[in-house]
């Protein structure tokens, strides 16, 4: 429960939230567990802590490891762990299972595909969507806020959907992609 798996691709932004939630006023300290070394809070660092969030801008394969967050209230300290794995970018179109977020199901009446983890990022529209690496085109596909809506869903719409967006931090832009499977169920 208080150890959370997070993953990303090298040279993309990755933002991880401390699995131990606290009230907004509580301070959060982050450490690299293997060395017990404190993660800096200064934004000039490629990897830095920002309250409940740990930011890799951009991520590198060598960042992989377990990170400890300690949330401190006036009277209690509570610990969480973020298990971070950064993978090399794939040269082909295949998205391996270990990079996939949870599968969502849709039907003719309800076909929303939510872009995983996007709420952690400072992004602005447009959100780009791809299916099996092909950019989605046509009036049946509507990118709305942080999700994709497919009109008149058919069984052929099942597959792997990738959302791509830009995270902005201090005027610099970083790409983020996230992929999940979509299955079509009968009404």
């Amino acid at each position: 429960k208080f150890s959370k798996q997070s993953w990303g691709l090298e040279n993309e932004a990755l933002i991880v939230r401390c699995p131990r939630q606290g009230k907004p006023s509580y301070t959060v300290d982050w450490y690299y567990s293997q060395t017990n070394k404190s993660i800096p809070t200064q934004k000039r660092n490629r990897v830095f802590a920002s309250g409940q969030l740990l930011k890799f801008l951009p991520a590198a394969v060598a960042d992989s490891g377990i990170y400890t967050c300690i949330v401190r209230s006036p009277t209690f300290n509570r610990t969480g762990y973020a298990n971070v794995t950064i993978y090399k970018k794939q040269s082909d179109c295949n998205v391996p299972d270990y990079l996939m977020y949870s599968t969502v199901s849709g039907s003719e009446k309800n076909s929303k595909i939510y872009c995983p983890t996007i709420d952690l990022y400072n992004w602005t529209a447009p959100l780009e969507w791809f299916k099996n690496c092909q950019a989605l085109q046509g009036s049946r596909y509507r990118a709305h806020k942080s999700f994709l809506v497919i009109d008149n869903v058919m069984t052929e719409d099942a597959g792997d959907y990738t959302c791509k967006f830009i995270h902005n931090e201090n005027g610099a832009n970083y790409s983020v992609t996230a992929t999940r499977s979509f299955t079509v169920k009968d009404e």
């Epitope: 208080f2 009230k23 209690f76 509570r78």
Partner: antibody, heavy 123, light 107 residues
């Protein structure tokens, strides 16, 4: 100094009603979840009900659901427990307590407790 | 609901001895477990939170351990003021539940 002071207990007949109050001081009442816990004479502790801070979401033990109502008045720093259709098995010392941490969808420990108020349900 | 079973029901020990109290959960509560001490006529007092962290002002002779379903409260050397009833409590999910208590009495 954090203080919780319960009042409103007493003797009531089965089927009757009672309203307990808990006056809080020494902390910013509105941001904390508050809880009622009871203890029957010579028995263990039983969670009764919880209420979120500003959001006000409520939770009840099955044994009191539909009969008890938890509420709060953040402007008065006061927690309430309205108890209706009281039964003999509701006889207990009722404590109010503070959850010092919980965030939406989670719970935590009880770090401060009142001294308790005794509710006796008997004919 | 999650049932917490404490053992033993009563522990008879002398001051200076080590007390080991057990709390077993009917399903995993991760580390969302607390221990309280209650003396006659008083409200419970928080000792341990998140299974192993001492609350503010609690003496170092009190320690908690365990995760998942099996937890232990240890009092390394009993002081006269430690003779009381001890309760475990889970807070992973509602309804919040307590164990039935272990009474630590003077032998």
């Amino acid at each position: 100094e954090v203080q919780l002071l319960e009042s409103g207990g007493g003797l009531v007949q089965p089927g009757g009603s009672l309203r307990l109050s808990c006056a809080a001081s020494g902390f910013t009442f509105s941001i904390y979840d508050m809880i009622w816990v009871r203890q029957a004479p010579g028995k263990g502790l039983e969670w009764v009900s919880s209420i979120r801070g500003e959001g006000g979401g409520t939770y009840y033990a099955d044994s009191v659901k539909g009969r008890f109502t938890i509420s709060r008045d953040n402007s008065k720093n006061t927690l309430y427990l309205q108890m209706n259709s009281l039964r003999a098995e509701d006889t207990a010392v009722y404590y109010c307590a503070r959850d010092p941490w919980s965030t939406e969808g989670s719970f935590f420990v009880l770090d401060y407790w009142g001294q308790g108020t005794l509710v006796t349900v008997s004919s | 609901e999650i049932v917490l079973t404490q053992s033993p029901a009563t522990l008879s020990l002398s001051p200076g001895e080590r007390a080991t109290l057990s709390c077993r959960a009917s399903q995993s509560v991760d580390d969302d477990l607390a221990w309280y001490q209650q003396k006659p006529g008083q409200a419970p007092r928080l000792l341990i939170y998140d299974a192993s962290n001492r609350a503010t002002g609690i003496p170092a002779r009190f320690s908690g351990s365990g995760s998942g379903t099996d937890f232990t409260l240890t009092i390394s050397s009993l002081e006269p003021e430690d003779f009381a009833v001890y309760y475990c409590q889970q807070y992973i999910t509602a309804p919040l539940t307590f164990g039935q208590g272990t009474k630590v009495e003077i032998k």
